[in-house]
């Protein structure tokens, strides 16, 4: 039975040209996190495998950095980076948990972080 919940940074905003950290956290389960996939819509950004380490998609290698932790750092942001991002937690023995983050990249210097929220 899947009892865990994914907590994410929720709706966030950042300035064009800047960087942002995408973070998710799995709680309320003793399941082992074996792999975390980071995806933007249907595009794979990066994978963190508990044993094998990190894989960064070739098309994002220049702008994506692994970490901190299981999170992902997006650099040199453009307006085109605005959209939904998903952290997909593969766990053993529970199965798969998914969290959602919405990033808005702003032209102006006004960029405030949104509140955290949970996805069961």
């Amino acid at each position: 039975m899947m009892t865990g919940t994914i907590e994410t940074t929720g709706n966030i905003s950042a300035e064009k040209g800047g960087s942002i950290i995408l973070q998710c956290h799995l709680s309320s389960t003793t399941a082992q996190v074996t792999q975390v996939n980071w995806e933007q819509q249907d595009q794979l950004l990066a994978i963190c495998n508990a044993d094998l380490g990190w894989h960064i998609s070739p098309s994002f290698k220049d702008r994506v950095a692994p970490g901190p932790g299981l999170g992902l750092t997006l650099q040199s942001l453009t307006v085109n980076d605005t959209g939904e991002y998903f952290c997909i937690y593969h766990t053993y023995p529970d199965g798969t948990y998914t969290g959602r983050i919405f990033l808005e990249v702003l032209e102006s210097s006004v960029a405030e972080h949104g509140a955290r929220f949970q996805i069961p």
């Epitope: 995806e39 508990a50 094998l52």
Partner: antibody, heavy 125, light 107 residues
Framework: QVQLQESGPGLVKPSETLSLTCTVS??????????LAWIRQPPGKGLEWIGS???????YYNPSLESRVTISVDTSKNQFSLKLSSVTAADTAVYYC?????????????????WGQGTMVTVSS | EIVMTQSPATLSVSPGERATLSCRAS??????LAWYQQKPGQAPRLLIY???TRATGIPARFSGSGSGTEFTLTISSLQSEDFAVYYC?????????FGGGTKVEIK
């Protein structure tokens, strides 16, 4: 190019423990970033994943076999092994060892990239 | 555990024709799907990973497509050496699971 070779008895008696070894050549387990896996195939049937181990000792087992399975690794001999206890005729199969995730860092996929030739194990008295 | 279902169980095709094999997952596996080919008396061989990327040395006549729960392996023009059993497999969720296989035989 990494190659795998299974070895062990071809005949095991019911209720005994099946023991197989996979020898890895062409690469070092201790420095390899991949899973070492066991998969079996009963005669005329499909493939069944038994379990996988990482060089650090992390193990993952098929829940249907977990109570009877032990997979271990011996980096000094460049080998990994399978032990399956309390066997019955239903455990008769070709047993394959395989490497999984060898290309993960470059290509981001985890699949069974390299397979041994397989060894037939019959459970019979 | 994710259950993989392949159809049809047997596919009869003439050499040179197109073969289309299906694989369905009981829940979404995104694009984390591999296809293997197995000939009699041999170990399986990796054909496709990531649902659509050919493994090293695999001919262009093999192509994979799909994501989520529905996947397809297409062999555009069957050669004599392609008559074999094909398996799909999901990963990374543990436990790894295979489909029951599709046997492609000569019509």
């Amino acid at each position: 190019q990494v190659q795998l070779q299974e070895s062990g008895p071809g005949l095991v008696k019911p209720s005994e423990t099946l023991s197989l070894t996979c020898t890895v050549s062409g690469g070092s387990i201790s420095s390899g970033s991949y899973y070492l896996a066991w998969i079996r195939q009963p005669p005329g049937k499909g493939l069944e994943w038994i379990g996988s181990i990482f060089r650090s000792g992390s193990t993952y087992y098929n829940p249907s076999l977990e109570s009877r399975v032990t997979i271990s690794v011996d980096t000094s001999k460049n080998q990994f092994s399978l032990k399956l206890s309390s066997v019955t005729a239903a455990d008769t199969a070709v047993y394959y060892c395989a490497i999984e995730g060898a290309n993960f860092k470059d290509f981001g996929y985890v699949a069974f990239d390299i397979w041994g030739q397989g060894t037939m194990v019959t459970v019979s008295s | 555990e994710i259950v993989m279902t392949q159809s049809p169980a047997t596919l009869s095709v003439s050499p040179g024709e197109r073969a289309t094999l299906s694989c369905r997952a009981s829940q979404s596996v995104s694009s984390n799907l591999a296809w293997y080919q197995q000939k009699p008396g041999q170990a399986p061989r990796l054909l496709i990973y990531g649902a659509s990327t050919r493994a090293t040395g695999i001919p262009a006549r093999f192509s994979g497509s799909g994501s989520g729960t529905e996947f397809t392996l297409t062999i555009s023009s069957l050669q004599s050496e392609d008559f074999a059993v094909y398996y799909c497999q999901q990963s990374p969720p543990w436990p790894r699971t295979f489909g029951g296989g599709t046997k492609v035989e000569i019509k």
